[in-house]
Interface confidence: low
């Protein structure tokens, strides 16, 4: 079973280790990629595996390769190893895990790292209908069009730490375009967007990014952040540079940066509190329902993002945070067909200056079957039912017990035809002694 686009298209969201330990004598190592896990063709990438100071050797496995992919001796002080890919090609795209050996034996496998290559196909065209200039409260549809038929389309927003939406059409029913409607538009929708296209046979291979499209939202006074600028920096595109700069902020903008940051955090906390309150009420009201009747689950599997690069360089990963605008809980969705094979993942870092409202996508002239939409891979949390999870594990070379993925406290809520899945994660452990970010939450919305 192919990992979902939500999984591998968290541009740069290479999977970090979960905080829990698996059974076994040695803790699993951390696996990450620099400058990120989404790399354009021909560019170099370094995969890092970090274990313990007792590690004597590191080993990297690439899924579906018949043999171990690489082995390296540790770099001093022996707690990590470097695996270099001098020039990214299709052959390197895929799913990796690493192990380390200490005097007591081999470690557990790391959580998987999904290395995605862009530039495999010609770039699609991204346009806005009716116009990229939209008034707050109105509707706009972003249209991603490819020259040749593709079955997967992805919409990303620059400087957001995640892909906003992806759309996978019915198997075999390839499209030349995909629509990403946004309604009602708010100020947070403003910004620069790009889209990618891909074939379902390899979700690790993406097209070149489309040219950027800037969405200008006017007529909003409640927006706490500066209006989106018209200048587009193509250098900081969604491929090899972080989508969300975590480095230094110019001094002139530092105060404004923190104001925005604090504002976003406060709003996020308030919204999260409200959300949890509503969910608690829902849970109390629906206590009599059986698990099989519940439409959505809220679970808190342990999770953690990968560590920041030791050199303090820019990175793609960030702690996903709640990014749910109250008015955007699919309120605009009317008559959504329950079989639409669409999955959405909204994540936003506490550092992100550009929180993204939840939207949804549909394929023009298609009714994707739900069974054709791949279930989320571990990258987006294990939200598989028993059958799907087994199928996913069967696909993997290194099967891991699904027991650790069982939800602990499960609450249920019905949101129209959507399922809201909320997963708590922990911030990336700091290698530099910096104080960790606040624990954060992200939500995944999936049409059922």
């Amino acid at each position: 079973m192919i990992p979902t686009f939500t999984a591998l298209l968290c541009l740069g969201l290479s999977l970090g280790p979960r905080t829990h330990m698996q059974a076994g004598p040695l803790p699993k190592p951390t696996l990450w990629a620099e400058p990120g896990s989404v790399i354009s063709w021909g560019n170099s990438v370094t995969i890092w595996c970090q274990g313990t100071l007792e590690a004597r050797e590191y080993r990297l496995d690439k899924e579906e390769s018949p043999a171990p992919w690489d082995r390296q001796n540790p770099l001093e002080p022996k707690n990590k190893a470097r695996f270099s890919i001098p020039s990214m090609t299709e052959d390197y795209a895929g799913r990796y895990r690493c192990y380390y050996r200490s005097p007591v034996g081999w470690s557990q496998p790391s959580d998987p790292l999904e290395l995605v290559m862009t530039g495999a196909y010609s770039k699609p065209t991204l346009s806005a209908l009716p116009s990229p200039l939209v008034t707050s409260g109105k509707s706009v549809t972003l249209l991603c069009q490819s020259r040749s038929p593709m079955d997967t389309f992805l919409l990303i927003k620059e400087r957001a730490a995640h892909p906003l939406l992806h759309l996978r059409s019915e198997h075999g029913a390839q499209q030349h375009q995909a629509e990403f409607p946004m309604s009602p538009v708010t100020s947070v929708h403003g910004g620069t967007y790009r889209c990618f296209s891909s074939h379902g046979f390899s979700h690790y291979l993406l097209s070149h990014p489309s040219d950027p499209l800037e969405l200008i939202v006017s007529g909003s006074l409640e927006d706490p952040r500066p209006s989106p600028t018209r200048s587009v920096s193509t250098a900081a595109g969604p491929e090899d540079q972080p989508l969300m700069p975590t480095g230094s902020v110019p001094h002139s903008g530092l105060r404004r940066h923190w104001e925005v940051l604090i504002g976003v955090l406060v709003v996020s906390i308030l919204l999260l509190s409200l959300l949890l309150f509503l969910l608690l009420q829902h849970w109390r009201q629906g206590k009599h329902r059986t698990l099989a009747q519940r439409q959505a689950d809220f679970q808190r599997p342990p999770g953690a993002a990968e560590p920041e690069p030791k050199d303090g360089g820019l990175q793609r990963r960030s702690s996903p945070a709640a990014d749910v605008q109250g008015e955007n809980f699919c309120a605009a969705v009317k008559n959504t067909q329950p079989e639409d094979g669409v999955e959405m993942d909204t994540r936003q870092s506490p550092h992100d200056e550009d929180p993204q409202a939840v939207t949804y996508a549909k394929v023009k002239h298609s009714r994707p079957r739900r069974e054709m939409a791949s279930p989320p891979s571990p990258l987006s949390g294990e939200f598989l039912d028993t059958k799907d999870r087994q199928a996913e594990e069967d696909r993997q070379m290194d099967t891991e017990a699904a027991a650790s993925e069982a939800p602990q406290d499960v609450t249920y809520a019905q949101l129209h035809s959507f399922t809201l899945r909320q997963k708590a994660t922990e911030p990336p452990p700091s290698q530099e002694g910096a104080s960790p970010a606040e624990p954060s939450v992200y939500a995944t919305l999936a049409i059922h």
């Epitope: 018949p66 043999a67 992919w69 690489d70 082995r71 695996f83 890919i85 001098p86 052959d91 081999w106």
Partner: antibody
Framework: SLEESGGRLVTPGTPLTLTCTVS????????MTWVRQAPGKGLEYIGF?????IAGYATWAKGRFTISKTSTTVDLKVTSPTTEDTATYFC?????????WGQGTLVTVSS | ELDLTQTPASVSAAVGGTVTISCQSS????????LSWFQQKPGQPPKLLIF???KLASGVPSRFSGSGSGTQFTLTISDVQCDDAASYYC???????????FGGGTEVVVK
């Protein structure tokens, strides 16, 4: 397919390079391994080169052999052969799961 | 350094019978299962039979089976055929290529 070449009679100390020419195999996808077998003896694992071009060697082989590759060949250099290096040398695809082998090339080291 | 001890060194079996070859590692292998089995006939390169301790290689009859984990591994040939007369080798991997090694081999004679 895999085809080894370069095997010949050499005197001790004379460097020798064996070449494994691959066809229909993408060396960007597969690690390659060298194995040898002295006459009437068992198999000996020499080392490998992975898809990024990093080589690894058996403990006994380190310093005595160098493995390198191009897009279509994998070379094994015997840096300073001794009579103990007389053997048939095989190249094989993959690392441990050696699923495709060449026919081998015979190296004889004699003074 | 990894040491793989193969037993017996030689075994004879009747057609239709069963042969069991053992391979014992001095240390637990990588992922407890990084062991392959090969068949080699005189004048030919080895042929992969089993990889990752128990997985049957493509095109290999199901009469061949592998089992074991950690340090103890077994190759079983059931319903032995005349064509099975050959030498059999295990190949284990512990760490970094330096300790990838073959067992000493077992000669199977079919009566």
């Amino acid at each position: 397919s895999l085809e080894e070449s370069g095997g010949r009679l050499v005197t001790p100390g004379t460097p020798l390079t064996l070449t494994c020419t691959v066809s229909g195999i993408d060396l960007n996808k597969y690690a390659m391994t060298w194995v040898r077998q002295a006459p009437g003896k068992g198999l000996e694992y020499i080392g490998f080169i992975n898809i990024v071009g990093i080589a690894g060697y058996a403990t006994w082989a380190k310093g005595r052999f160098t493995i390198s590759k191009t897009s279509t060949t994998v070379d094994l250099k015997v840096t300073s052969p001794t009579t103990e290096d007389t053997a048939t040398y095989f190249c094989a695809r993959n690392w441990i799961r050696l699923d495709l082998w060449g026919q081998g090339t015979l190296v004889t080291v004699s003074s | 350094e990894l040491d793989l001890t193969q037993t017996p060194a030689s075994v004879s079996a009747a057609v239709g019978g069963t042969v069991t070859i053992s391979c014992q590692s001095s240390e637990s292998l990588y992922k407890k299962n990084y062991l392959s089995w090969f068949q080699q006939k005189p004048g030919q390169p080895p042929k992969l039979l089993i990889f990752e301790a128990s997985k049957l290689a493509s095109g290999v009859p199901s009469r061949f089976s592998g089992s074991g984990s950690g340090t103890q591994f077994t190759l079983t040939i059931s319903d032995v055929q005349c064509d099975d007369a050959a030498s059999y080798y295990c190949l284990g991997d512990y760490t970094n290529g330096r300790d990838t090694t073959f067992g000493g081999g077992t000669e199977v004679v079919v009566k």
